[in-house]
Interface confidence: medium
């Protein structure tokens, strides 16, 4: 008779990573038998949830249960009804919810008790919401990218798993950018790491590892943009700002209440003569450059070197996967390939910004128009963050790897914070059974 | 200790070409930069270009792109550059440095320079 | 290109002299890409300052660095004769790499 595979035996999780702007759900599974070894665990499902972050539910909590509704549901079907008991569920909350709470704690906890009162009525097995700190954010990247790309895994293969993964065991760096935050993390060349808040230590798989990590807050692309108009409005004449960051044409009012709202504009607030402003666009690439450069601090360093507003920042060192809207921005923009060069970026930047309106309106009309006034802004951001910010060059440019998605699973934080949260990266390599993981009888 | 050696002064005609050497020793030669810089007589410096002998990348100056050519052998551990073309214009003595690769700083400056060559243009 | 205008283009200091060069660049540049070279005549240029305010080795530390954004100056606490030579700033935040006009100080 034929051998028959047993049923699989499949464990699954879920991540609901709580951003500033959005909300995504993610599911992933592993094989159980396998759960120590590198590189098994997989997503399945995302599910993007309607509507804004849940920081922007701190006046309608009671709206946070329906609000999570549609992607819950999701995962009982994605998921067999006999694992849901078994299916942890976890809510990591990042750099809008760390906003929140500066501002105030008790309001931050309401919206997390509320989220965790929604959670819990779900058939799965809830382990907690909470406010990740920038660090862990950082970090849990580096864990995804590096486990996804077969990093920590002692076999060295002969194939390669994706077109720019090298055989070598040397570690890829994580850029990270979010709309309110954004991450850099790397393992530095022989280098002493100077401030203990940016240096971590992992022993995965029997390797140890010295980590660098900072994660900024307020220079995530959507913050950052407050950051700049806020600064702008300040030296403006009147309620009108001409902003080379917007294309020829385009028009906004902005309420000035909505812009000393956030915590990251309060270095720029002052009284102005008006309630509200209208932006109206230049489309300038180099003046919007100048203008973001503005944002970062570089004259004051208290370390041997450092990014910027006094953050230690070693050399950088090896490739870089740089993911999340790093990625989302550059994709839009057609700026993701391995053969365009920083220079070619630049000057594509400056024809897309240059563009009129009316123009880009009628060749994206698929895209809404509030996202899409934003990219000429959001693709200089990026150019003068890693610039300027981290200290890339024309030359090291590629090193950056502008990555969506590894074998299928999104870059991101929210595998590595169900990988550390399940137990499922060893601190020492795993012994190598002799016998084969698949059973047949 | 770290040193680059350039060759000896060079008179040549108008239109010839020329190429002109620039011996590494001290140091990892194919973990720098090498630039080459101009300095006409009583002027200031003028960035040509850099070759990695890593990945023998270069990357010119567009004013000196269709006139310099910049190759390394990295078994004798030396850049060159070659000068087409030349006229009066590229008379001048012309300095070969080095300068720290990506991963292996946070300052990119050309930290050791070697002693010139002297290229004179005449007929 | 990134323009680096640097003044003044000529000067003289008597030995315990304050002397401050200015280099005004053309667009905001990070202070870590911007140097500073000596050189004496009839040799070649040597490292300086790095990075706006780092001082080579070998640099006596009269000299200074300082700056941010587009400004930027090396200034030497108390003039000295060997201090006589041209100094250059150079950026590497864009290509073409570019250099000042140069300074010439000379000793009174």
């Known amino acids: 008779t034929q051998n028959k595979a047993l049923p699989e035996n499949v464990k699954y999780g879920i991540v609901l990573d709580a951003g500033s702007s959005h909300t995504s759900l993610y599911i992933y599974k592993w094989p159980a038998e396998k759960e120590n070894d590198t590189g098994v665990v997989h997503q399945v499902e995302e599910c993007r949830v309607k509507g804004p972050g849940i920081s922007k539910f701190v006046q309608k909590v009671n709206e946070i249960g329906i609000y999570l509704t549609d992607c819950m549901e999701r995962a009982r079907e994605v998921i067999p009804r006999s694992q849901h008991q078994e299916t942890p569920v976890y809510l990591g909350a990042t750099a809008g919810m760390r906003l929140l709470r500066m501002e105030s704690e008790e309001l931050a906890d309401r919206v997390l008790d509320v989220v965790e009162r929604s959670l819990s009525n779900y058939p799965f097995d809830f382990q907690g919401a909470r406010i990740i700190t920038g660090q862990e954010e950082g970090a849990y990247g580096w864990i995804t990218i590096n486990y996804l790309l077969g990093k920590f895994s002692q076999k060295t293969r002969w194939f390669s798993i994706v077109p720019y993964e090298t055989n070598n065991q040397e570690t890829f760096g994580a850029l990270d950018l979010g709309g309110a935050s954004t991450q850099v993390t790397f393992v530095p060349q022989n280098q002493t790491i100077e401030s203990p808040d940016n240096a971590l230590q992992f022993r995965l798989y029997g390797k140890d590892y010295n980590v660098y990590t900072h994660s900024f807050l307020c220079y995530g692309k959507d913050q950052a943009l407050w950051q700049k108009l806020a600064k702008d409005i300040q030296v403006a004449s009147n309620e009108i700002l001409r902003d080379p960051c917007f294309h020829p044409g385009y028009k906004k009012v902005v309420n000035v209440s909505d812009l000393y709202k956030t915590p990251c504009t309060k270095r720029f607030e002052m009284t102005l003569p008006f309630q509200q402003f209208e932006i109206q666009g230049i489309g300038n690439y180099q003046q919007c450059h100048q203008s973001i450069l503005e944002l970062f601090n570089t004259s004051y360093c208290p370390y041997s070197q450092c990014a910027f507003n006094g953050i230690f920042l070693p050399p950088l060192q090896g490739d870089f996967g740089a993911f999340s809207a790093f990625y989302f921005v550059m994709k839009f923009l057609n700026l993701t390939s391995e053969k365009v060069s920083q220079e070619k970026v630049t000057e594509m930047m400056k024809k897309f910004c240059a563009q009129p309106w009316e123009e880009i309106k009628t060749s994206y009309a698929g895209v809404k128009e509030k996202y899409l006034s934003e990219y000429c802004f959001s693709g200089t951001y990026i150019l003068s963050l890693l610039l300027q910010g981290y200290h890339f060059t024309a030359d090291s440019w590629e090193h950056i790897h502008f990555i969506g998605k590894i074998q299928g699973s999104d870059a991101g934080w929210t595998l590595g914070y169900m990988l550390n949260l399940t137990n499922m990266i060893p601190a020492e390599q795993p012994l190598s059974t002799p016998l084969s993981h698949s059973t047949y009888v | 200790q770290v040193q680059l050696q350039q060759s000896g002064p060079e008179l040549v005609k108008p239109g010839a070409s020329v190429r002109i050497s620039c011996k590494a020793s001290?140091?990892?030669?194919?973990?720098?930069?090498v630039h080459w810089v101009k300095q006409r007589p009583g002027q200031g410096l003028e960035w040509i270009g850099w070759?990695?002998?890593?990945?023998?990348?270069?990357k010119y100056n567009e004013k000196f792109k269709a006139k310099a050519t910049l190759t390394a052998d990295k078994s004798s551990s030396t850049g060159y550059m070659q000068l087409s073309r030349l006229t009066s214009e590229d008379s001048a003595v012309y300095f070969c440095?080095?300068?720290?690769?990506?991963?292996?700083?946070?300052?990119?400056?050309?930290?050791?320079w070697g002693q010139g060559t002297s290229v004179t243009v005449s007929s | 290109e990134i323009v680096l205008t640097q003044s003044p283009a000529f000067m003289a200091a008597s030995p315990g002299e304050k002397v401050t060069i200015t280099c005004s660049v053309s667009?905001?540049?990070?202070?870590?890409?911007l140097h500073w070279y000596q050189q004496k005549s009839e040799t070649s240029p040597k490292p300086w300052i790095y990075?706006?305010?780092n001082l080579a080795s070998g640099v006596p530390v009269r000299f200074s660095g300082s700056g941010s954004g587009t400004s930027y100056s090396l200034t030497i606490s108390s003039m000295e004769a060997e201090d006589a030579a041209t100094y250059y700033c150079?950026?590497?935040?864009?290509?073409?790499?570019?250099f000042g006009s140069g300074t010439k100080l000379e000793i009174k």
């Open positions: 070759i990695y002998p890593g990945n023998v990348n270069t």
């Open positions: 150079q950026q590497w935040s864009d290509y073409p790499l570019t």
């Open positions: 440095a080095r300068s720290p690769y990506y991963g292996t700083t946070y300052y990119y400056t050309m930290d050791y």
């Open positions: 001290g140091y990892t030669f194919t973990g720098y930069y």
């Open positions: 990075g706006t305010s």
């Open positions: 667009l905001i540049i990070s202070s870590r890409n």
